[in-house]
C-alpha cells in the first residue's frame, strides 16, 4: 500500500513539476526590467527565451520573437536546450511511469517489469528536474552578471547634459516557476526511485517441501536468496500450477473497466 502511495504521489508531483517546466519555458517573464533605483519609465520591458516584450502605460503590449538562431547569445541557446531536454525527458518519464503505476494493470505485466519502469521514469524525472534547475540557474547567473555590469555604467553622460538610462533586468516570474517546477520534478523522481525498491520482488529462501495430493500435485519451488535490486526474475512466492503461473498480486486481475481505478 505504502509503495503504491509513494509511486502515485511521485507521479503526481512529477506531473505538476513537468507542467511547471513547460509553463516556465513558454513564459515571457524570464527577465523583467528592474524598477528599483531607476527613473520611472512609462514602458516596462521583459524578456523570455523565445521573445522580448514591451508593455506601455497605455496598456499596449508588443512582443517580438527572436527570429535568429546564430545571433543569439550562446548562454540563451544553452538554457533553451536544457529546458527542452528537461521537457522531453519529463514527458517520456511520464509516459513510462503511467505504465509502471501499480494501480494500473496492463496485460500480465510482472512486478519486476513495473519496478524497472518505475526506476527508469524516476531517473528520467531526476535528470529532467536537474536540467530545468540548471537552465534556470544559468539564466539567473547571466542576469546577475549583466545586472552588475549595467549598474557599473548605468548613467553614461553624453556631452555633460544628456543622460541615457540603461535598462537593467532582474529575475522574472519564470525563474521562480522553473526552480520550483524543477525541484518538484526532482522530488517526484526520487519518490519513484524509492517506490521502485518496494516494487522490486525479493526472492525468499524456502525449504523444498513437496506436497502430494490426489489429482493435482503442487510444488513450492525454492529460489536462492538475492538482494533486491529491482532487476532479475520475479519469483516471489510464485505458485506453480499446471494451468500456468500467476503472482499473488495478479490473482484478481480480471480484465475490467475498473482496472486503473
Amino acid at each position: 500500500m505504502a509503495v503504491t502511495a509513494c509511486q502515485g504521489l511521485g507521479f503526481v508531483v512529477s506531473l505538476i513539476g513537468i507542467a511547471g517546466i513547460i509553463a516556465a519555458t513558454c513564459m515571457d517573464q524570464w527577465s523583467t526590467q528592474d524598477l528599483y533605483n531607476n527613473p520611472v519609465t512609462a514602458v516596462f520591458n521583459y524578456q523570455g527565451l523565445w521573445r522580448s516584450c514591451v508593455r506601455e502605460s497605455s496598456g499596449f503590449t508588443e512582443c517580438r520573437g527572436y527570429f535568429t538562431l546564430l545571433g543569439l547569445p550562446a548562454m540563451l541557446q544553452a538554457v533553451r536546450a536544457l529546458m527542452i531536454v528537461g521537457i522531453v525527458l519529463g514527458a517520456i518519464g511520464l509516459l513510462v511511469s503511467i505504465f509502471a503505476l501499480k494501480c494500473i494493470r496492463i496485460g500480465s505485466m510482472e512486478d519486476s517489469a513495473k519496478a524497472n519502469m518505475t526506476l527508469t521514469s524516476g531517473i528520467m524525472f531526476i535528470v529532467s528536474g536537474l536540467c530545468a534547475i540548471a537552465g534556470v540557474s544559468v539564466f539567473a547567473n547571466m542576469l546577475v552578471t549583466n545586472f552588475w555590469m549595467s549598474t557599473a555604467n548605468m548613467y553614461t553622460g553624453m556631452g555633460g547634459m544628456v543622460q541615457t538610462v540603461q535598462t537593467r533586468y532582474t529575475f522574472g516570474a519564470a525563474l521562480f516557476v522553473g526552480w520550483v517546477a524543477g525541484g518538484l520534478t526532482l522530488i517526484g523522481g526520487v519518490m519513484m526511485c524509492i517506490a521502485c525498491r518496494g516494487l522490486a520482488p525479493e526472492e525468499t529462501n524456502y525449504k523444498a517441501v513437496s506436497y502430494h495430493a490426489s489429482g493435482h500435485s503442487v510444488a513450492y519451488k525454492p529460489g536462492g536468496f538475492k538482494a533486491s535490486t529491482g532487476f532479475g526474475s520475479n519469483t516471489k512466492n510464485k505458485k506453480i500450477y499446471d494451468g500456468g503461473a500467476r503472482t499473488e498480486d495478479e490473482v484478481q486481475s480480471y480484465p475490467s473497466k475498473h482496472d486503473y481505478v
Epitope: 512609462a42 514602458v43 522580448s52 514591451v54 506601455e56 517580438r64 544628456v162
Partner: antibody, heavy 118, light 113 residues
Framework: EVQLQQFGAELVKPGTSVKISCKAS????????MDWVKQSHGKSLEWIGD????????RYNQKFKDKATLTVDKSSSTAYMELRSLTSEDTAVYYC???????????WGQGTLVTVSA | DIVMTQSPSSLPVTTGERVTMSCRSS????????????LTWYQQKPGQPPKLLIY???TRDYGVPDRFTGSGSGTDFTLTISSVQAEDLAVYYC?????????FGAGTKLELK
C-alpha cells in the same frame, strides 16, 4: 467611438475646492488609465497624473501632489479630479485624456475651464 | 523631470512652403526593449484640445496627412510639414512619453508671414 465628455466651465473663489468630471464612453472604462492635463492660458501643457479605474491607484506629477486628487466611479464610467486650496495660478483649462500607442494622448475631453477669482 | 526644448517658438510661413521644427529632450527617449523612441507630436488649434499627429517619433496617427513627417532618435527630434496648408496653422507640441512625469515642450507656433 471613444468619447471623453467634460463640462464647460467652473468659476470658484480662492482657497476653495472644485471637483471636475470626465465621463468616458465608447470603450471599456476599466481597461485604460485616465490622465489629466493642465493648460494655463497661452501656455504649454502640464501632465497632472493618472488614475487606474480598476484599482483606483494613482500616479501624480510631484508638482500637483498636494493640489489634485484623482478618483473614479466605475459604475458611471466617470473620472474625477478635485483641485484644492485654489489660487489664481490654478486658473487654466483642465483636460482628461486617454493613452494610446506609444503612450501618446489620442483621446481628449473638450476641457473644463476653471477660473479662480474673488 | 525631463526637459523638452522646442525651437523655434514661432515660425512664420507661407502656404506651400516646407517647414521643419525641432524638439530636444534632456534624456534619451529610446527604449532598448523595442528600439522605439517615445516622443509624440501634437497639433493644437485655438479653443480645441491637442490633436495627436505622430507617436513613436515617426509613426503617423490614423487620418493624419502624409505631409506630416516625424524623424529623429535619442534626444533630437524633428517634425516636418512638406507643404504647409492653411489648416496647418496651429501650435505644435512635442511630448516625452517615456519618463514619468510626462512633459511637453513649450510649443512652436506656426503662423502666416
Amino acid at each position: 467611438e471613444v468619447q471623453l465628455q467634460q463640462f464647460g466651465a467652473e468659476l470658484v473663489k480662492p482657497g476653495t475646492s472644485v471637483k471636475i468630471s470626465c465621463k468616458a464612453s465608447g470603450y471599456t472604462f476599466t481597461d485604460y488609465n485616465m490622465d489629466w492635463v493642465k493648460q494655463s492660458h497661452g501656455k504649454s501643457l502640464e501632465w497632472i497624473g493618472d488614475v487606474n479605474p480598476n484599482y483606483s491607484t494613482t500616479r501624480y506629477n510631484q508638482k500637483f501632489k498636494d493640489k489634485a486628487t484623482l478618483t473614479v466611479d466605475k459604475s458611471s464610467s466617470t473620472a474625477y479630479m478635485e483641485l484644492r486650496s485654489l489660487t489664481s495660478e490654478d486658473t487654466a483649462v483642465y483636460y482628461c485624456a486617454r493613452l494610446y500607442y506609444g503612450n501618446s494622448f489620442a483621446y481628449w475631453g473638450q476641457g473644463t475651464l476653471v477660473t479662480v477669482s474673488a | 523631470d525631463i526637459v523638452m526644448t522646442q525651437s523655434p517658438s514661432s515660425l512664420p510661413v507661407t502656404t506651400g512652403e516646407r517647414v521643419t521644427m525641432s524638439c530636444r529632450s534632456s534624456q534619451i527617449l529610446l527604449n532598448s526593449g523595442n528600439q522605439k523612441n517615445y516622443l509624440t507630436w501634437y497639433q493644437q488649434k485655438p479653443g480645441q484640445p491637442p490633436k495627436l499627429l505622430i507617436y513613436w517619433a515617426s509613426t503617423r496617427d490614423y487620418g493624419v496627412p502624409d505631409r506630416f513627417t516625424g524623424s529623429g532618435s535619442g534626444t533630437d527630434f524633428t517634425l516636418t510639414i512638406s507643404s504647409v496648408q492653411a489648416e496647418d496653422l496651429a501650435v505644435y507640441y512635442c511630448q516625452n512619453a517615456y519618463f514619468y512625469p510626462f512633459t511637453f515642450g513649450a510649443g512652436t507656433k506656426l503662423e502666416l508671414k
